[in-house]
């Protein structure tokens, strides 16, 4: 129960905490278990003990093994074991499972990735963050304190995130990296009365006679996958298919997108070679789901010709 697994990479700093806790005033002795040899406390040593912490500055593969810590108080002794493994640096980008810290799960709301074990180190902000070995760039990523915040989390944000920081010990700097997986979970979906994003109700669109124009009907229906969610155009209250005018066509199929996690559906009405009679029609954008139907109306008007008179 009082044994803890710790790992690191060669030539990086590794700091291990004794699995047995005690007040900071308690003395903690560290030993190399195989030989029962005491770990020195002098900081000039590459490996030294500092209270509850055992420091490898830097670590070497040969440091791997089990270390014993004994917390000594006036009334009791508590023994713990630190199982330390130091690995060779990987030549490629791939981070093997045995170097990974616990996976964190994220969602649109849940978007912090903490840098593992950083609390043990004397680090200075900002941290560097990498995803699948690529440095993170862009305003969606905010490195703050010991964590990374991702704005507007999307499914393709899933992956392996590595934090890199510098540990400072008596003026000497040592690099530390730590990697954990980030998975994106679907938030619980829900359905609601449709909300039409476009067009605005009773909107008027200016068009030029003889030109082509597109009208987009866009509505959102809730979050996650929807059982029923459809948008369509009507002309003067009739289905497009019932309106025998080949110049006016509704886009085949409907485009479903997820905007901020919302399930939104778009369909485009394409009008070729706009004619005067098209200005007399009423164009209705209809959004329908199990909660009901919402309708927004848009009309076309002629663009004012440019006045060429002097």
């Amino acid at each position: 129960k009082f044994s803890k697994q710790s790992w690191g990479l060669e030539n990086e700093a590794l700091i291990v905490r004794c699995p047995r806790q005690g007040k900071s005033s308690y003395i903690v002795d560290w030993y190399y278990s195989q030989t029962n040899k005491s770990i020195p406390t002098q900081e000039r040593n590459r490996v030294f003990a500092s209270g509850q912490l055992l420091k490898f500055l830097p670590a070497e593969v040969a440091d791997s093994g089990i270390y014993t810590c004994i917390v000594r108080s006036p009334t009791f002794n508590r023994t713990g074991y630190a199982n330390v493994t130091i690995y060779k640096k990987q030549p490629d980008c791939n981070v093997p499972d045995y170097l990974m810290y616990s996976t964190v799960s994220g969602s649109e709301k849940n978007s912090k990735i903490y840098c593992p074990t950083i609390d043990l180190y004397n680090w200075t902000a900002p941290l560097e963050w990498f995803k699948n070995c690529q440095a993170l760039q862009g305003s969606r990523y905010k490195a703050h304190k010991s964590f990374l915040v991702i704005d507007n989390v999307m499914t393709d944000d899933a992956g392996d995130y590595t934090c890199k920081f510098i540990h400072n010990e008596n003026g000497a700097n040592y690099s530390v990296t730590a990697t954990r997986s980030f998975t994106v979970k679907d938030e619980q979906g829900f359905s609601r009365f449709p909300v039409i994003r476009a067009p605005a109700h009773n909107e008027t669109k200016e068009v030029e006679i003889g030109e082509n124009t597109n009208l987009t009907c866009s509505a959102c229906f809730g979050k996650g996958a929807q059982f029923l969610a459809t948008v369509q155009w009507q002309l003067n209250g009739n289905k497009i298919t019932d309106f025998s005018e080949p110049r006016i066509q509704q886009e085949e199929g409907q485009n479903q997108s997820f905007s901020n996690g919302l399930a939104c559906v778009n369909t485009v009405l394409r009008i070729a070679d706009v004619k005067e009679e098209d200005l007399l029609l009423r164009y209705d954008c209809l959004a329908l789901n199990l909660h009901g139907l919402r309708r927004h109306t848009i009309r076309l008007s002629r663009k004012n010709p440019i006045d060429h008179q002097s």
Epitope: V104, G106, K109, N110, S111, K112, T124, H144, K145
Partner: antibody, heavy 118, light 111 residues
Framework: QSVEESGGRLVTPGTPLTLTCTVS????????MSWVRQAPGKGLEWIGY?????NTYYASWAKGRFTISKTSTTVDLKITSPTTEDTATYFC???????????????WGPGTLVTVSS | AAVLTQTPSPVSAAVGGTVTISCQSS????????LAWYQQKPGQPPKILIY???TLASGVPSRFEGSGSGTQFTLTISDVQCDDAATYYC???????????FGGGTEVVVK
């Protein structure tokens, strides 16, 4: 190093009110700042914070009701449309420098009392 | 939003005795350790005692000890003094963008 709140007063419901937290002895470019409130005889309630890099975050119940902004030496909390439930002492608190978490505030102001009443 | 549930008030303690206050979170705090303990006396702002679940804040006597991880945390005050009479709050930080949450507070009465 200290922080002090000001601007608390009696306001009628719906009248916007801005509280100001003035800091001295440290830089707002190195510390996050939080606003916390406490209704009379009640517990503490976290409202939101503004990070050293100017990003603002709010408790879910506070979104739209409060706005946090800052200058080089002040942090403002705007109560957009106060209701009687917003009657409380409002505290400004400094987040510890270089702490890893977001819950540790080492310097607090004495608080400023806001009373919302018609 | 997360909910932090503290030991119900009031908790009585004798001078020289030990008092334990628990704080349970409905979800894991950030990094499993983003929890702080505060002491508040009437008419005063809160004062930080413990941060990162178990780290003693500067100037705070070692009689105060924080422990726990994930969702379950404890503040232990040993060798209780009259001056420890106050209300104690836990505050958790979470993986959410925001929603830091205070516990409801636990009043400690010293006899």
């Amino acid at each position: 190093q200290s922080v002090e709140e000001s601007g608390g007063r009696l306001v009628t419901p719906g009248t916007p009110l801005t509280l100001t937290c003035t800091v001295s002895g440290f830089s707002l470019s190195s510390h996050d700042m939080s606003w916390v409130r406490q209704a009379p005889g009640k517990g503490l309630e976290w409202i939101g914070y503004i990070w050293s890099d100017d990003n603002t975050y709010y408790a879910s119940w506070a979104k739209g009701r409060f706005t946090i902004s800052k200058t080089s030496t002040t942090v403002d909390l705007k109560i957009t449309s106060p209701t009687t439930e917003d009657t409380a002492t409002y505290f400004c608190a400094r987040d510890q420098y270089r702490s890893s978490g977001v819950s540790d505030y080492d310097i607090w102001g004495p608080g400023t009392l806001v009373t919302v009443s018609s | 939003a997360a909910v932090l549930t503290q030991t119900p008030s009031p908790v009585s303690a004798a001078v020289g005795g030990t008092v334990t206050i628990s704080c349970q979170s409905s979800q894991s705090v950030g990094n499993n350790n983003d929890l702080a303990w505060y002491q508040q006396k009437p008419g005063q702002p809160p004062k930080i005692l413990i941060y990162k679940a178990s780290t003693l804040a500067s100037g705070v006597p070692s009689r105060f000890e924080g422990s726990g991880s994930g969702t379950q945390f404890t503040l232990t005050i040993s060798d209780v003094q009259c001056d420890d009479a106050a209300t104690y709050y836990c505050l958790g930080g979470y993986d959410d963008d925001a929603d830091n949450t205070f516990g409801g507070g636990t009043e400690v009465v010293v006899k």
